[in-house]
Amino acid sequence: TPEVWVQVRMEATELSSFTIRCGFLGSGSISLVTVSWGGPNGAGGTTLAVLHPERGIRQWAPARQARWETQSSISLILEGSGASSPCANTTFCCKFASFPEGSWEACGSLPPSSDPGLSAPPTPAPILRAD
């Protein structure tokens, strides 16, 4: 069964800056990745970035840099400097559309007691939806 993992990390150098990393554990080819803030994409969250393998990357504030890390994982840096940055309990979700598996989504947030710059290794988050 495919899985999606989500890792949220606060940067040590910029305490209000977050890095979100997401990955897809499956054999299909990814056609689209959507990262959202506040809840699942299309069901409670607002879109931060949309990454398409061929059509490129779109991002919205407070996303600062979205990029592909591998063919099946992405990373997204949120702007910091105190300019309306998210709180530590903020929910971030990643939705992967792949063929032939369909859409798989998981959410994560910063561990409550995590030190800046430190985070647990990425683990599969609970899968919220499989369309």
């Epitope: 506040g38 809840g39 409670g44 504030a61 940055s85 929910t91």
Partner: antibody, heavy 118, light 106 residues
Framework: QVQLQQSGPELVRPGVSVKISCKVS????????MHWVKQSHAKSLEWIGI????????NYNQNFKGKATMTVDKSSSTAYMALARLTSEDSAIYYC???????????WGQGTLVTVSA | QIVLTQSPTIMSASPGEKVTMTCSAS?????IYWYQQNPGSSPRLLIY???ILASGVPFRFSGSGSGTSYSLTISRMEAEDAATYYC?????????FGSGTKLELK
């Protein structure tokens, strides 16, 4: 159809607080984030912040931290914004605005006029 | 924060006339959104992603631009277009709006 119904006008004394509401209908409240926007003669339109009714997560414009507090009540599909320690500079029309399927202010409430006067 | 400067502040046009207003950003933005506001009404989404018309918006409206320079054009002015127009960016928090261009009917 999507509707955002805001509470009526408020005439308040300086130093007090006020809480305005935005009751939604025509869609599932927790499916879309809500924004609040201030409109005054002095500064045109100013974004106050965003709240996710799904998670309760908020994000504020630094200029309104300590001034505005956004909350939601899922049971009544209503978003609220409280404004603290009002001064004449807070006199304005306040709008709630819902996003579309992508980030944009697709739907707006009719606005709530807040007048601060001694 | 990104400052959006709209010009002109006020302009007037006769019915059928072509109208162009601009929005200049203090630093590069990915897209611009345009809103129309009639007196006593709430703002209404007109154009998103710089050039895409929102639902129900007449085809006489168009948007263009990139980087720091954007514009809104009305190909043929109509009486109902008399309103104030605001540009807005979603590239960086805090989200910001321009100060508006008031379009009057001549």
């Amino acid at each position: 159809q999507v509707q955002l119904q805001q509470s009526g006008p408020e005439l308040v004394r300086p130093g007090v607080s006020v809480k305005i509401s935005c009751k939604v209908s025509g869609y599932t409240f927790t499916d879309y984030v809500m924004h609040w926007v201030k409109q005054s003669h002095a500064k045109s339109l100013e974004w106050i912040g965003i709240i996710s009714p799904y998670s309760g997560n908020t994000n504020y414009n630094q200029n309104f931290k300590g001034k505005a507090t956004m909350t939601v009540d899922k049971s009544s599909s209503t978003a609220y914004m409280a404004l603290a320690r009002l001064t004449s500079e807070d006199s304005a029309i306040y709008y709630c605005a819902r996003e579309g399927d992508l980030p944009m202010f697709a739907y707006w409430g009719q606005g709530t006029l807040v007048t601060v006067s001694a | 924060q990104i400052v959006l400067t709209q010009s002109p502040t006020i302009m007037s046009a006769s019915p059928g006339e072509k109208v162009t207003m601009t929005c200049s950003a203090s630093s590069s933005v990915s897209y611009i959104y345009w809103y129309q506001q009639n007196p006593g009404s709430s703002p209404r989404l007109l154009i998103y992603d710089t050039s895409i018309l929102a639902s129900g918006v007449p085809f006489r409206f168009s948007g263009s631009g990139s980087g720091t320079s954007y514009s809104l054009t009305i190909s043929r002015m109509e009486a109902e277009d008399a309103a104030t127009y605001y540009c807005q960016q979603w590239t960086s928090y805090p989200l910001t709006f321009g100060s508006g261009t008031k379009l009057e009917l001549k």
